[in-house]
Interface confidence: low
């Protein structure tokens, strides 16, 4: 019975030894008696392509149409988005299905990571300060008279005691002033101011003090200006 | 200004379907996967769903697979949040959620399940 | 997707510190730098308060600062100030999805 090759090609013949008819032994894919009918495998029940992937019947076998992110004749491999390392400036890549998500370092931002923020953007610097923006950080270039991150202090310029002779100081943006205790003047109070001048005793000598001067007088004459 | 704005909130009974929507302006929308956020009356915030940039990726949080869909349409600036069987537990405000390094919240959309 | 774990409430009062943990997985807070800190109002949507474990957004007051060792985040509010009392959510990525922290109420006594 097989003489005639009733069966499909690529499928073996046996003769029932019984009847004396053609068996066919039909390989994957293939069914009916002559083993010429192509086996839906997308209709079998089960979807044999992974991951949701759609199923396409052909001849003796089958295709997997895979959705993004997966690949492998059964779409059973979940691509690696990350093997491209498309994240930049250091940022950490999340392998998600079907695409990928950078985490960005601070001081950055984008799908990628690859813009550098402008920190200096909200204008942190205070007291007129410029602004440096830099990776993650900015750096204020404070003016004179202020310090600190943000120029936020004022400098105390009473701090290197300026002021003398018991002279009061008083701090500014940028300066000082002395406040001199009677008797002293100068920026820094350093001048004792001399009371003798003009000559206060009118018939005497004058001798200077601190914020009073004495009459010597001559003989003959008194009071405090030897008037 | 960046900002979000829910819509579509409202009383369902339960089994029934409503569509969330939430318009986006003031960045560039289809460079960001959005988010949607709930929050239950009294209690915590719980992740629904995101959805990638182009909308090619979707997730969905146990609770809600199955029942909820996540779209965007990025011609239009908008993200939608379809969502049928609603049950009684799905009652809360839904936050629409720009979640990344410069975070973004809408101001929510009540939905409440109830017969 | 299991919500990560903070201590239902904590207090303090004024211009005293607190801290607030939050406490996950080696899948989730352990595996990225990716925490957030949330700050909520009644009736308010959240605000975003620190990001990427311990920066702050332009606007929010250095008395906020984060921190992340292991498993564990915190928040840590110095100078505590009426206008500090709120729910505060932590939350973190993980493979595929965002997750948050059951919240924390902040209570500022006197």
């Known amino acids: 019975a097989c003489i005639s090759n009733p069966c499909n090609e690529g499928s073996n013949c046996d003769t029932n030894p019984v009847n004396g008819k053609a068996i066919c032994t039909c390989p994957s894919g293939y069914t009916g008696p002559a083993c010429s009918q192509d086996v839906d495998e997308c209709a079998l029940g089960a979807n044999p392509c992974e991951h949701a992937g759609k199923c396409l019947n052909t001849l003796g076998s089958f295709e997997c149409q895979c959705l993004q992110g997966y690949t492998g004749p059964r779409c059973e491999i979940d691509v690696n988005e990350c093997i491209s390392n498309p994240c930049q400036n250091d940022a950490t890549c999340l392998d998600q299905i079907g695409e990928f998500q950078c985490i960005c370092m601070p001081g950055y931002e984008g799908v990628y990571c690859e813009i550098n923020t402008d920190e200096c953007a909200s204008s942190p610097c205070l007291h007129n300060g410029h602004c440096m923006d830099k990776i993650n950080e900015f750096q204020c270039q404070c003016p004179k008279g202020f310090n600190g991150h943000l120029c936020q202090y004022d400098v105390d310029e009473c701090a290197s005691t300026p002021c003398k002779n018991g002279a009061k100081c008083l701090d500014g943006p940028n300066t000082y002033t002395c406040v001199c205790t009677e008797g002293y003047t100068g920026t820094h109070c350093e001048v004792d101011i001399d009371e003798c001048d003009p000559d206060p005793c009118h018939y005497g000598s004058c001798k200077d003090g601190v914020a009073t001067f004495t009459c010597l007088c001559q003989p003959g004459y008194t009071g405090h200006h030897c008037e | 200004e960046v900002q979000l704005l829910e819509s579509g909130g409202g009383l369902v009974q339960p089994g029934g379907s409503l569509r969330l929507s939430c318009a986006a302006s003031?960045?560039?929308?289809?460079?960001?996967?959005m988010s949607w956020v709930r929050q239950a009356p009294g209690k915590g915030l719980e992740w629904v769903s995101s959805i990638s940039g182009y909308g090619s990726n979707t997730y969905y949080a146990d609770s809600v697979k199955g029942r909820f869909t996540i779209s965007r349409d990025n011609s239009k600036n908008t993200l939608y949040l379809q969502m049928n069987s609603l049950r009684a537990e799905d009652t809360a405000v839904y936050y629409c959620?720009?979640?990344?390094?410069?975070?973004?919240w809408g101001q929510g959309t009540l939905v409440t399940v109830s017969s | 997707q299991s919500a990560l774990t903070q201590p239902a409430s904590v207090s303090g009062s004024p211009g005293q510190s607190i801290t607030i943990s939050c406490t996950g997985t080696?899948?989730?807070?352990?595996?990225?730098?990716?925490v957030s800190w949330y700050q909520q109002h009644p009736g308010k949507a959240p605000k975003l308060m620190i990001y990427?474990?311990?920066n702050r957004p332009s606007g929010v007051s250095n008395r906020f600062s984060g921190s992340k060792s292991g498993n564990t985040a915190s928040l840590t509010i110095s100078g505590l100030q009426a206008e500090d009392e709120a729910d505060y959510y932590c939350q973190s990525a993980d493979s595929s999805s965002w997750v948050f922290g059951g919240g924390t109420k902040l209570t500022v006594l006197g």
């Open positions: 080696s899948s989730d807070i352990g595996g990225y730098q990716y």
């Open positions: 003031g960045f560039t929308f289809s460079n960001y996967g």
């Open positions: 959620a720009r979640i990344s390094q410069q975070a973004v």
């Open positions: 990427y474990v311990s």
